[in-house]
Interface confidence: low
């Protein structure tokens, strides 16, 4: 970009770093120093003022940092003024075109379409922009500026390119990329190079989204590797680029794109839920409460855009009403308000829960701690104060199975006069038939039974939820409706809790935090077990984490906490996903004892299931009609598997497979073939064969011939047929062909020589073969062969072997005609 | 190859029971869990839980509790679902699915068995 | 549980074209979406798991990406055989396992 000097350097004074610049200097300057002298840079007390101006209309301005080219001689700077930059280098002008810093991509595609890019409706059209600031300090050298504008919502920024001449001169390199995207946007990116020498530096900061709000770093060249993707939860990215001298590394390639911002997942009430349509700007959050519970706030919130999106309100809260009516009860909840707030410390609650005619009520003690000197619960057997009591904590204990009362209606009435502690009431009811048993209720679990309308002689069986237990634990599970005259459970119902420690041997499963969903209480020490089969892993599924400061989950990588440490998880966590080496997972939640924080620590829901290992190769079938061994139990890398064969089959493939380092079979697995073919029958000594079929399958035939001068001995004609079992077979032996004509006598040895095997008799075909010894020639045929007829005779004479007449050693041995 | 190759299809009352079959091969049976995922039609998929082949372990959406129950026969590497109390809203085709044994998906299906409950 | 949106009910294309099918999901589930094709009268077919990852054999037309809550199976350029319904599942969270509505892609 041919830009005038004018717009790229102030006049001196006239910009002011803005407290965002300033926040941005202090945290450069910071993690900088952290990089220590054996860099090369090292704390001054002066900072440049120089300050590059952004393009017309940006207002970011990013002091640049102190720097000393040698050790001890403090801060350098370069003097600016309005004209240009003194200094014995190339003048400003002439470094205005920037190598290419900043590069756009490939127009995005509809499958990841970034935001939009335009204005839309009425909003204001605004541009992604990259301001690039490059101030190089030395004593002879001006700024280098990098620096490029993009208008997309993706691109990339490269490491500048530093193999021009005048870059060669440059002493030090400062480079900041600042990235800016639509408000409601945040940048994420991802390294796809990074390969910087020890010398150089690169700083990833999240910047301040609007002035006054300092930037954050999010990572510097230590925490980078290849493959990384980092997110900055604000609308604005700086990168910032340090290198010493001409970089000797490879530089970076950093893609970024703009994603859109959400708001965070709003907090469940206590005592009630909330149900999100979408995180993102329009989405809406609805809260409910529990039963016994009145929603104090908005119902719905709405997600709003915005540079950091948010919802439209205050998280609504569930409160327990004092006292009340209930018309027409069915099935329901009366439970304490919180005492304090604008209750007060003194509480005098009266309900009054009527049922419909013919009915009767069972209120079940849920949750009861009353203080024993201020507060009072009377229960009275209908509707007025002065119905008889059927309960009064004064004098009663908290009946297990609950009071039925004996008209329609209920008067519970509550007395608290400043407790010395705090008080917790939950008392659940039911309305039902006279002549039959209430439903028994279970929270977190299961009631299974005989007869759904409880009638007397009903059963009812009771099981937990995945990560709940029975509690009291152990048999009884189940109750029976007893007494046809006054129905009645013969024994209380027990209750589902989610447990502090347990074994776990399931599949899969849940592991909750102690009493979930309540909020677990401080001083635990839990240890949980999880036991998959051998030969099998455990996925762990981190859903919610939620715990207070200092309270800590520990996940050990098998049996027990003296196990490796797979992880180590405190505070609220986002969903993530492990996985264990082994079949053995040990899971430990320490919360120290102490009062908790209010508002503080919901606890936490993971998930697990058993997944095959994988670290070994996959599973392969046996073969059909033949077996395999394995070296291994598990088919861990190295693992060698061994195929063979039944009688009659026959092996298509490799006879042995092992498991490679990258976990793939060195071969496809072999698979075993019923054999359909004669085994080759093979070829006849003086004689040849004809065959049918050259594979000689089944119903093939083998025809053998003899040589003249031999005559067969057996079936010309063989067959190959099929058996039941094993291997096709041949109709016949092979055949010989046996000579017919009387042998050759042995034409005796010549004079100075000798034959290879001294026999009397040769049979026709049979050769005979003559040696001279050292100092004699062979004058005539080196071997001779017996032919057949009546009589057989030798092809020729034999050879003489006459004195040498030359010195050459190749004919001492053996001769030629 | 792995395939699963399912029973045939039935036509059932309202308030009868149904029993689809699922014979798995090609493949270690007891190593993958499978699950069972329903299409009314013209509608889309519905999941119905999952057993583990190894253990008998069993895990259903909450809409089946108490009418469905997944069992299986390791000796013939045969999952079976069994689903009572049938009403019209029921007919179905029902498919069987080979989990991925590294997450929640389905990678091998059945080629499905359609129910029918009509008076 | 976790409710997934499909957009659109019926995409209407000519082979060759590029089709671009959504899937949102009511809450983050981060990677964790599979996608299906199913034709008439067959059982569906796995092309995609983890948001971005193909199935073995799928061809390298079909292509995922996402996460979080907004997802995408782009077809590069259609093939006559590739006109079906599409489905998403979340192999999120569980029980229990949701799959959207379904997407049909026709023969304009």
């Known amino acids: 970009l041919p830009l005038k000097e004018e717009e790229i350097l102030p006049e001196p004074g006239s910009e002011t770093p803005t407290v965002a610049s300033e926040a941005l200097a202090e945290l450069l300057h910071g993690a900088l120093l952290r990089r220590g002298p054996e860099m090369g840079y090292l704390p001054g007390s002066d900072r440049d003022p120089t300050l590059a101006t952004p393009p017309a209309g940006q207002t970011l301005a990013v002091p640049s940092l102190p720097r000393a080219t040698e050790p001890g001689t403090g801060p350098l700077t370069t003097a600016v003024t309005p004209n240009g930059v003194r200094g014995a280098g190339p003048t400003a002008p002439e470094l205005l075109t920037p190598p290419p810093g900043t590069t756009a991509p490939p127009p995005p595609s509809p499958a990841s379409p970034g935001p939009p890019l335009g204005p839309e409706g009425g909003e204001e059209e605004t541009t992604t922009t990259i301001i690039t600031t490059t101030t190089v300090t030395t004593t002879v050298t001006s700024p280098v500026l990098c620096n490029n504008n993009i208008s997309e919502g993706e691109g990339y920024v490269e490491s500048p390119d530093l193999g021009s001449p005048v870059s060669r001169t440059l002493g030090l390199l400062d480079c900041t990329y600042s990235i800016h995207v639509y408000p409601g946007y945040g940048i994420e990116i991802q390294v796809q190079t990074l390969n910087l020498s020890q010398e150089e530096e690169l700083l990833v900061l999240a910047g301040g989204g609007s002035p006054g709000l300092a930037p954050r770093l999010l990572a510097n060249s230590s925490m980078l590797g290849e493959g990384q993707v980092l997110r900055s939860p604000t609308n604005r990215l700086l990168l910032h680029f340090q290198s010493p001298r001409v970089p000797r590394g490879g530089g970076f390639r950093i893609h970024y794109q703009a994603y859109l911002l959400s708001c965070g997942f709003p907090p469940r009430p206590a005592h009630g839920d909330v149900s999100v349509t979408d995180l993102h700007p329009g989405g809406t959050a609805t809260f409910h409460c529990d039963s016994g519970y009145q929603l104090q706030g908005e119902e719905t919130l709405i997600c709003l855009n915005g540079t950091r999106p948010s919802w439209n309100g205050e998280t609504p809260s569930c409160m327990a009403s004092c006292g009340g009516t209930i018309h027409n009860a069915t099935l329901g909840r009366i439970v304490s308000p919180e005492p304090g707030g604008a209750v007060g410390p003194n509480l005098t609650c009266r309900w009054v829960i009527e049922a419909a005619e013919g009915r009767r009520l069972h209120l079940h003690f849920e949750r009861v701690s009353l203080d024993e000197d201020n507060d009072r619960l009377m229960v009275r057997s209908g509707g007025s104060p002065l119905s008889p009591v059927i309960y009064d904590s004064d004098m009663d204990d908290v009946p297990e199975r609950g009071l039925i009362s004996d008209a329609q209606s209920l008067y519970v009435e509550l007395l608290s006069e400043t407790p010395a502690n705090p008080l917790l009431l939950s008392l659940r009811f039911e309305a039902f038939e006279e002549d039959r048993c209430f439903a028994p209720f279970l929270a977190h679990g299961n009631v299974t039974t005989t007869d759904p309308e409880y009638r007397p002689g009903a059963l009812a069986t009771f099981s937990c939820l995945p990560g709940y237990a029975l509690e009291p634990p152990g048999p009884p599970n189940a109750i029976e409706c007893v007494d046809p005259t006054e129905p009645h459970w013969n024994d209380t119902e027990p209750a589902c809790k989610a447990m502090c420690g347990g074994e776990l041997s399931e599949p899969a499963g849940v592991v909750l935090s102690p009493d979930w969903p309540q909020s677990y209480s401080p001083g635990q020490d839990c240890v949980w077990g999880v036991h998959v089969q051998e030969e099998k892993r455990i996925l762990l599924q981190v859903e919610i984490l939620n715990v207070r400061e200092g309270d800590m989950l520990t996940l050990f990588d098998g049996d027990g906490p003296s196990a490796r440490v797979l992880a180590q998880l405190r505070g609220p966590q986002p969903r993530r996903r492990l996985l264990s080496s082994g079949p053995d997972l040990t899971l430990q939640f320490q919360a120290p004892p102490g009062p908790p924080n209010p508002g503080l620590g919901q606890g936490f829901v993971l998930h697990f299931k058993e997944v095959p290992r994988n670290d070994t190769c996959p599973e392969l079938p046996p073969p059909e009609w033949g077996w395999r061994t394995a070296s291994h139990g598990d088919l861990i890398r190295g693992t060698v598997l061994t195929y063979q064969c039944e009688p009659g089959y026959e092996l298509l493939g490799s006879d042995i497979l092992t498991c490679q380092w990258d976990l793939s079979w060195s071969a496809a697995p072999p698979a075993c073939q019923k054999i359909m073919t004669c085994a080759d029958p093979g070829e006849i000594a003086n004689g040849h064969r004809t065959a049918s079929d050259a594979g000689f399958p089944v119903g093939s035939h083998v025809q053998y011939r003899c040589l003249p001068g031999y005559s067969l001995e057996g079936a010309a004609m063989l067959t190959c047929y099929s058996r039941d079992t094993g291997t096709p077979k041949w109709s016949d032996r092979v055949p010989k062909c046996a000579l017919k004509y009387e042998p050759c006598l042995n034409p005796g040895v010549p004079e100075n020589g000798y034959q290879t095997l001294y026999k009397h008799h040769y049979q026709a075909g049979e050769s005979l073969r003559f040696f001279c010894y050292e100092g004699f020639e062979l004058i005539g045929e080196v071997t001779i062969t017996c032919v057949p007829g009546h009589p057989s005779q030798w092809t020729s004479q034999p050879p003489l072997c006459k004195v040498t007449q030359t010195t050459d050693p190749s004919r001492q041995l053996e001769g030629g005609n | 190859q792995v395939q699963l190759v399912q029973s045939g299809a039935e036509v059932k009352k309202p308030g009868a029971s149904v029993k689809v079959s699922c014979k798995a091969s090609?493949?270690?049976?007891?190593?993958?869990?499978m699950h069972w995922v329903r299409q009314a039609p013209g509608q889309g998929l519905e999941w119905m839980g999952w057993i583990n082949p190894n253990s008998g372990g069993t895990n259903y959406a909450q809409k089946f509790q108490g009418r469905v129950t997944m069992t299986r026969d390791t000796s013939i590497d045969t999952a079976y679902l069994d689903l009572s109390r049938l009403r019209s809203d029921d007919t179905a085709v029902y498919y069987c699915?080979?989990?991925?044994?590294?997450?929640?998906?389905?990678?091998?299906w059945g080629r499905g068995t359609l129910v029918t409950v009509s008076s | 549980e976790i409710v997934l949106t499909q957009s659109p009910a019926t995409l209407s294309l000519s082979p060759g074209e590029r089709a671009t099918l959504s899937c949102r999901a009511s809450?983050?589930?981060?990677?964790?979406l599979a996608w299906y094709q199913q034709k008439p009268g067959q059982a569906p077919r796995l092309l995609i798991y983890?948001?971005?990852n193909r199935a073995t054999g799928i061809p390298a037309r079909f292509s995922g990406s996402g996460s979080g809550t907004d997802f995408t199976l782009t077809i590069s350029s259609l093939e006559p055989e590739d006109f079906a319904v599409f489905y998403c599942?979340?192999?999120?969270?569980?029980?229990?396992?949701?799959f959207g509505g379904g997407t049909k892609v026709e023969i304009k």
């Open positions: 599942q979340q192999h999120s969270n569980w029980p229990p396992l949701t």
């Open positions: 699915a080979k989990d991925s044994g590294y997450d929640w998906y389905f990678d091998i």
């Open positions: 090609g493949y270690t049976f007891t190593a993958y869990y």
């Open positions: 809450q983050n589930i981060s990677s964790y």
């Open positions: 983890d948001a971005s």
